[in-house]
Structure formats: structure tokens, C-alpha cells
């Protein structure tokens, strides 16, 4: 299903109804939906453990900020936000015996940070997109997507893993940032919310969609993730908001329609190969970029993000086949398997299109420009 | 350069449980699947089972009933059950390394143990 | 449960020649998940092949493998002394088998 071009000057558009509006005043985000960027109590004194993978002796990520005096050492992002309503409860949690500091769960404990020392970063993902403070950066081109148009057979492996659902994908889905930042997919994932709680990592001005999807991405200077792991640019993600419209979403509804086969956690099954690319906007041209990290643990940072302008429409029915079907562990729900936002402490995220540019009602407070970094710098 | 060493008894009584831990040394244990595979003499490679971190388990159907895999992320080890061991549970055990984080994308078993030979035997 | 079935049993070869493992599934495998590992007595396995294709790290290029579906082969384009051993073909889904092995043998 191919999604209609949101218009020009409207970042982020597209209601429940599909149209071209950008996010009106009914959207605004509600107190507790607004990003937290205060520190959780304690998570300062973590114990330290060992490095991951690809993380050994590298220097911290630099911010794309011309800046660096705005960046606050004492800023810590915030990994769990337990008093947000929005905030899972309860999910992906398992009741193992033993010092086992490696399962984590939304919402609470362990703190990320015990789990992976990288949660503590200072770049981490999600994070609320400003597009007002976006920067332009016209060096940004439009996204190349090539074979991921895939045939019926070999058929693909979709997973529920205890924390989301996963479709693994296989060789040959190459995608290109620009030139010379080219990318293989290796997996796609969804994040979602509950009845009537939207579920997506990533926020615009505070407003948070009904769901998110991820197509996750190693870059082809490496063979392996865990080499990739921490590296600047090893890992990249295509994220796309997902919204309630009037139709049913074919292209989603072939991975829906067999959730219930993989409702227990750890469950797999095995679909027909499809066209990935139908489960992105069909816009590749606009879009926000920034440095982030992995949104669960090992939380690792380097992640390029790539966060799509145009939103993708699924049905009511659709959205809550998704949110109400997976169990986790512990015979729970597997719902609001989302990060709380993480402050960006001095990054600025770049946009491809004039973002800041904006017809909306908030389009009348002043803009700040924010200088673009010419991508590959 | 990651190392794993088995270690525990080479000698198990029948109708025992054989016990066994690998070690993991030169790296993290964390984010990735942990296995344990077997051969008797002069046969083949037989999968016992894996373990991720977060303690997650697959083993084989065979061995289902009797198998039980346990991690211990602050001590980098890994632990290997086999209740109610026979004769026919003799073999090499090896521990091995397999893919990283619950991504479903495998890169094999690239790192393994020596092996430690068990024998059953009253 | 898939099972993977090797063949030849045995390949009698001599160095310099170009060695043809195969390798047959029971039921489609993803190329994600299909292994070659080489083992030598005494020796605990190594990985040779992963994805069906991509050489492990450290490994000579005159190793290769291909394949999809059900049908998967290591081949062998100049077998050295040290070539000689017993190959085992791996796939990994929520279980994971081992092919029989073929041993590759000076001849």
C-alpha cells in the first residue's frame, strides 16, 4: 500500500484520517507525554561492568553541535521515566533465579545502566524531534533502497522475542544514506502501546504515535554487528511512525494476520517474503537524522537515525491486533515497549527538507537555525 | 580474543546429573546466545541446547525433558544440567559462542571450547 | 525438526584438487542460518561458513560456499594438507542440527 506525499510545508503530516494537515492542537502532548529530562534518582552511582563489543578505547561520539560548551557533563539521560503513565509496566520481564543482569524489562528494574553501561550515554535514542529546530541540510538526499522487494519464497523468520515482534531479514537489502554510507538490513521491529496509549520511541514536539517501526541496518564496512556495535555509523535505522487510518494496510496485514501463531514469548514462525519497502512511507526524500543508540540494551551509541517525515496509515483494527496479541514473559502483556525520551545534550538533528518552514499554529514562535553538518563530516 | 573453558566432573554415575560450566574469558558474556553441543566418540556433532543472556532457552527435542541451562552474567559463566544420564550420554561436551543480541541474524558458532570428556559409567 | 543430510560420506582427494561438499535439508533453511565447520581429531570444531556464504574471519578464500532452499555446498578450490578433516554442514532456526559430516580424506 503506497501512502499519500504529505505537503511541502507540513513536517510530520497526516492525521488519523489520512490527510495532509500537520499535527494540530488536539495533538499537543499532555504533561506527563512531554520528554523528561531530568535524571532518575541514582542511576549516577551504577556499578560499571564490561565494555561491549566494538566499545573498547573509543572516544566519545561528538555531538553534531558547532557548540560543545552547551553540553553539560553532569547531564545523564533519562533511562527509565516509572512515574510517566504512558510508561510500560510489568513487560518483558523474566523471573529467573540467579545474579542475572542481563534480562531488562520496560519500566523498571534492573536500571539499563546495570544491564549495559552504554544506557548511561550521553547520545542515546529515542529522543523528541523539534522539527522548528531542526537543521536543513540539503546535502541529504533521498533514501536508496534496492532488494527489498522480496519473493514469496524463501520464506522469513517472524519472532516474538519477549520485548517486540521481529521479522529477520535476509541477504541482499541494501540501503544508502548518500554516497559512500551504504547499509544492509539485517531486521524490522515494531514498538507499540496499548488500547487507547500510543506506543511510538520517537516523539515530534511531544506528541507520541501509536507505533513505530524499525528496520535495522549494518553498515557494509563491517561483517558482523557486534563489530559494528559502538562504532560511529556501524549501525543505521529506518524509523516510520505509525498512524490510525481508514484502510487496512496490506502490506502490514501479512505480518499481522499471523501475530496470534506467535502470540507466547519466544514463538517464531515462518512467513512468505514481501515488500519491505511497502512498510515504509513511500516519501524517502524528507526525513530527520541524528546520532543515537540502540533504544534497548546494550543501548550502544554510533547508530545513525534516520526518522521518516511522512508517516505510514494502518487500521483501528490493525493497531490493536498489534498492541493487543503478544504476550512477554510471566504471562503479561507485551504492550508499551517503549524507551522513555532521552535528552540530547547538544545535538542537533538534521532534517532534508526545510522542516522548520511550518504552517501550524506553532509555526508563530521564533525559529532557531540550527547549522547543518554536511553529511560524512 | 574470546576464550571459553569447560570445566566439571569427567566421570558421572548413571541415573545422575551431569554438571557442567563454561567460562567465558576475554570478552563480555552479555547479548549473546551461549551453547552447548556434544559428540560421542567417533560419531557426530549433536546440539544439546543455548541459553541468551537474559536466560532464555532453546534445546534439542531429544533432550528436552532432561536439559537444563542456566547463565550467570557477574561470573561470565554458563551452566549445563543432563539429569538422569545413561550410558548413552557419553561423549565430549563443548561449549561454543553463537549469535549476538535476540536479533535472529547468526554468524555460527565462531568461538568454542576445547571440550571436556564425559564418561558414564557406574 | 530439519534434518540435514551430508554427502559423500567420504571424499578421497588429493592436495591441490578442488573438493564438492553437499549438503541437503529436509525442509527450506534461510541462508541466514546455514553454518560449515571443519573439524580435525582431537580439535574442537571451527566455523568455516556463515549466512550460507560469508567466510568467518581468518578463513582462506579457497573456501566457499553456496546454495539455497534445501541444497547447500562447501567446496574446496585447492585443497591444501591441512584441508584434510571432517566437515560438518549446521542449520540454526529454534533448533539447531548438524549434517553427519563428510571426511575428506588424502587419497
Known amino acids: 500500500q503506497r501512502l499519500p506525499r504529505m505537503q511541502e510545508d507540513s513536517p510530520l503530516g497526516g492525521g488519523s484520517s489520512g490527510e495532509d494537515d500537520p499535527l494540530g492542537e488536539e495533538d499537543l502532548p499532555s504533561e506527563e507525554d512531554s520528554p523528561r529530562e531530568e535524571d532518575p534518582p541514582g542511576e549516577e552511582d551504577l556499578p560499571g561492568e564490561e565494555d561491549l563489543p566494538g566499545e573498547e578505547d573509543l572516544p566519545e561520539v561528538k555531538p553534531k553541535s558547532e557548540e560543545e560548551g552547551s553540553l553539560k557533563l553532569e547531564d545523564l539521560p533519562t533511562v527509565e521515566a516509572p512515574g510517566d503513565p504512558q510508561e510500560p509496566q510489568n513487560n518483558a520481564h523474566r523471573d529467573k533465579e540467579g545474579d542475572d543482569q542481563s534480562h531488562w524489562r520496560y519500566g523498571g528494574d534492573p536500571p539499563w545502566p546495570r544491564v549495559s553501561p552504554a544506557c548511561a550515554g550521553r547520545f542515546q535514542s529515542p529522543v523528541d524531534i523539534r522539527p522548528q529546530l531542526a537543521a536543513f541540510c540539503p546535502a541529504l538526499r533521498p533514501l536508496e533502497l534496492l532488494g527489498f522487494q522480496l519473493p514469496p519464497l524463501p520464506e522469513l523468520r517472524l519472532r516474538n522475542n519477549g520485548h517486540s515482534v521481529q521479522l529477520t531479514l535476509p541477504p541482499g537489502l541494501e540501503m544508502a544514506l548518500g554516497p559512500g554510507r551504504e547499509y544492509r538490513a539485517l531486521q524490522l521491529h515494531l514498538h507499540w502501546g496499548a488500547a487507547g496509549r500510543p506506543g511510538s520511541e520517537h516523539t515530534v514536539e511531544g506528541h507520541r504515535f501509536p507505533a513505530e517501526i524499525h528496520v535495522v541496518h549494518l553498515s557494509t564496512a563491517f561483517a558482523r554487528v557486534d563489530e559494528a556495535l559502538g562504532r560511529p555509523g556501524g549501525l543505521a535505522v529506518l524509523a516510520a511512525f505509525l498512524e490510525e487510518g481508514p484502510e487496512e494496510n496490506s502490506a502490514y496485514e501479512q505480518l499481522l494476520s499471523r501475530l496470534e501463531e506467535i502470540a507466547e514469548e519466544g514463538s517464531e514462525t515462518q512467513v512468505p517474503g514481501l515488500d519491505i519497502s511497502a512498510l515504509l512511507p513511500s516519501d524517502f526524500s524528507r526525513y530527520f537524522q541524528y546520532e543515537g543508540s540502540l533504544t534497548t540494551p546494550p543501548c550502544a551509541q554510533g547508530v545513525i537515525w534516520t526518522v521518516f517525515n511522512q508517516t505510514v496509515m494502518l487500521s483501528a483494527k490493525q493497531l490493536h491486533t498489534l498492541s493487543d496479541t503478544l504476550w512477554g514473559p510471566g504471562d503479561s502483556r507485551l504492550q508499551l515497549n517503549f524507551r522513555a525520551t532521552q535528552p540530547l545534550n547538544g545535538r542537533v538533528i538534521e532534517a532534508s527538507f526545510p522542516a522548520g518552514v511550518d504552517s501550524s499554529p506553532r509555526a508563530a514562535e521564533p525559529v532557531q537555525l540550527n547549522s547543518c553538518l554536511a553529511a560524512g563530516d | 580474543q574470546v576464550q571459553l573453558q569447560e570445566s566439571g566432573p569427567g566421570l558421572v554415575k548413571p541415573s545422575e546429573t551431569l554438571s557442567l560450566t563454561c567460562t567465558v574469558s576475554g570478552g563480555s558474556i552479555s547479548f549473546y546466545y551461549w551453547n552447548w553441543i556434544r559428540q560421542p566418540a567417533g560419531k557426530g556433532l549433536e546440539w544439546v541446547g543455548r541459553?541468551?543472556?537474559?536466560?532464555?532457552?532453546n534445546y534439542n527435542p531429544s533432550l528436552k525433558s532432561r536439559v537444563t541451562m542456566s547463565v550467570d552474567t557477574s561470573k561470565n559463566q554458563f551452566s549445563l544440567k543432563l539429569s538422569s544420564v545413561t550410558a548413552a550420554d557419553t561423549a565430549v561436551y563443548y561449549c561454543?559462542?553463537?549469535?549476538?543480541?535476540?536479533?535472529?541474524?547468526?554468524?555460527?558458532?565462531?568461538?568454542w571450547g576445547q571440550g571436556t570428556t564425559v564418561t558414564v559409567s557406574s | 525438526e530439519i534434518v540435514l543430510t551430508q554427502s559423500p560420506g567420504t571424499l578421497s582427494l588429493s592436495p591441490g584438487e578442488r573438493a564438492t561438499l553437499s549438503c541437503r535439508a529436509s525442509?527450506?533453511?534461510?541462508?541466514?542460518?546455514l553454518a560449515w565447520y571443519q573439524q580435525k581429531p582431537g580439535q574442537a570444531p571451527r566455523l568455516l561458513i556463515y549466512g550460507a556464504s560469508s567466510r568467518a574471519t581468518g578463513i582462506p578464500d579457497r573456501f566457499s560456499g553456496s546454495g539455497s532452499g534445501t541444497d547447500f555446498t562447501l567446496t574446496i578450490s585447492r585443497l591444501e594438507p591441512e584441508d584434510f578433516a571432517v566437515y560438518y554442514c549446521q542449520q540454526y532456526g529454534s533448533s539447531v542440527t548438524f549434517g553427519g559430516g563428510t571426511k575428506v580424506e588424502i587419497k
Open positions: 561454543a559462542r553463537g549469535g549476538f543480541l535476540e536479533w535472529d541474524y547468526y554468524y555460527g558458532m565462531d568461538v
Open positions: 525442509q527450506s533453511v534461510s541462508v541466514t542460518y
Open positions: 541459553i541468551y543472556t537474559s536466560g532464555s532457552t
